[in-house]
């Protein structure tokens, strides 16, 4: 069965700066990938960016980099001032679009005793919802 | 819950120009659907797909208005545009948005998946 996996660093060298770290464990081609906040896009959740493997990243503030890091993860550094920042409880999350497999999505947060730079290993989350 | 608020309707001569817009909004978050589009219905017709454009800019437009209309969103990607010139009387229908998401990120042929709908907008093209 595929998994999403979803991992939540808060930068030592900016306090309220965040990477979000995401991947997919299946055998099936990536469509798309879609990273939101407070919620799954669209249920509550605001798309902070999607990347589509050849059609390009959209990315709306405040992700300030969006990339792909392998063909089936990717990471998002979110600048962290203003209204919009996020902060220590902030749930933030993935959703890849497969072929053949269909849609997976999976959230994370900041691990509450986590210090600036360090995170949780990036362990498979619990799947929201398969489509 | 997301709602879709057409505005820009009216009343213009045949050869004239219209811009329709359509914000979506949502209570608590933002919604940037994948694909936002437009559709029609003339009096007494079925609905007609009018143009799409998806989160990546790529667009599609009905062969009737291809050359005429010009479909737009803004970066913010909640907001839908649609530029009208040239209007003939046969464009004179209830101007509606439609919005959703969809695998790939494209829009769906013939508006399968986009599950939000606006209220429309009335456009008539009479001298």
């Known amino acids: 069965t595929p998994e999403v996996w979803v991992q939540v660093r808060m930068e030592a060298t900016e306090l309220s700066s965040f990477t979000i770290r995401c991947g997919f464990l299946g055998s099936g081609s990536i469509s798309l990938v879609t990273v939101s906040w407070g919620g799954p896009n669209g249920a509550g959740g605001t798309t902070l960016a999607v990347l589509h493997p050849e059609r390009g990243i959209r990315q709306w503030a405040p992700a300030r980099q969006a990339r792909w890091e392998t063909q089936s993860s990717i990471s998002l550094i979110l600048e962290g001032s203003g209204a919009s920042s996020p902060c220590a409880n902030t749930t933030f999350c993935c959703k890849f679009a497969s072929f053949p497999e269909g849609s997976w999505e999976a959230c994370g947060s900041l691990p509450p005793s986590s210090d600036p730079g360090l995170s949780a290993p990036p362990t498979p989350a619990p799947i929201l919802r398969a489509d | 819950e997301v709602q879709l608020v057409e505005s820009g309707g009216g009343l213009v001569q045949p050869g004239g120009s219209l811009r329709l817009s359509c914000v979506a909004s949502?209570?608590?978050?933002?919604?940037?659907?994948?694909?936002m589009a437009w559709f029609r219905q003339a009096p007494g017709k079925g609905l007609e797909a009018v143009a799409g454009i998806d989160i990546f800019g790529g667009t599609t437009y009905a062969d009737s208005v291809k050359g005429r209309f010009t479909i737009s969103r803004d970066n913010a990607g909640f907001s839908l545009y649609l530029q009208m010139n040239s209007l003939r009387a046969e464009d004179t229908a209830v101007y509606y948005c439609?919005?959703?998401?969809?695998?790939?990120?494209?829009?769906?042929?013939?508006?399968?998946?986009?599950?939000?709908w606006g209220q429309g907008t009335m456009v008539t093209v009479s001298s």
């Open positions: 949502a209570s608590g978050f933002t919604y940037r659907p994948y694909c």
């Open positions: 439609a919005a959703g998401d969809s695998p790939d990120g494209r829009c769906p042929p013939l508006g399968q998946g986009l599950n939000y």
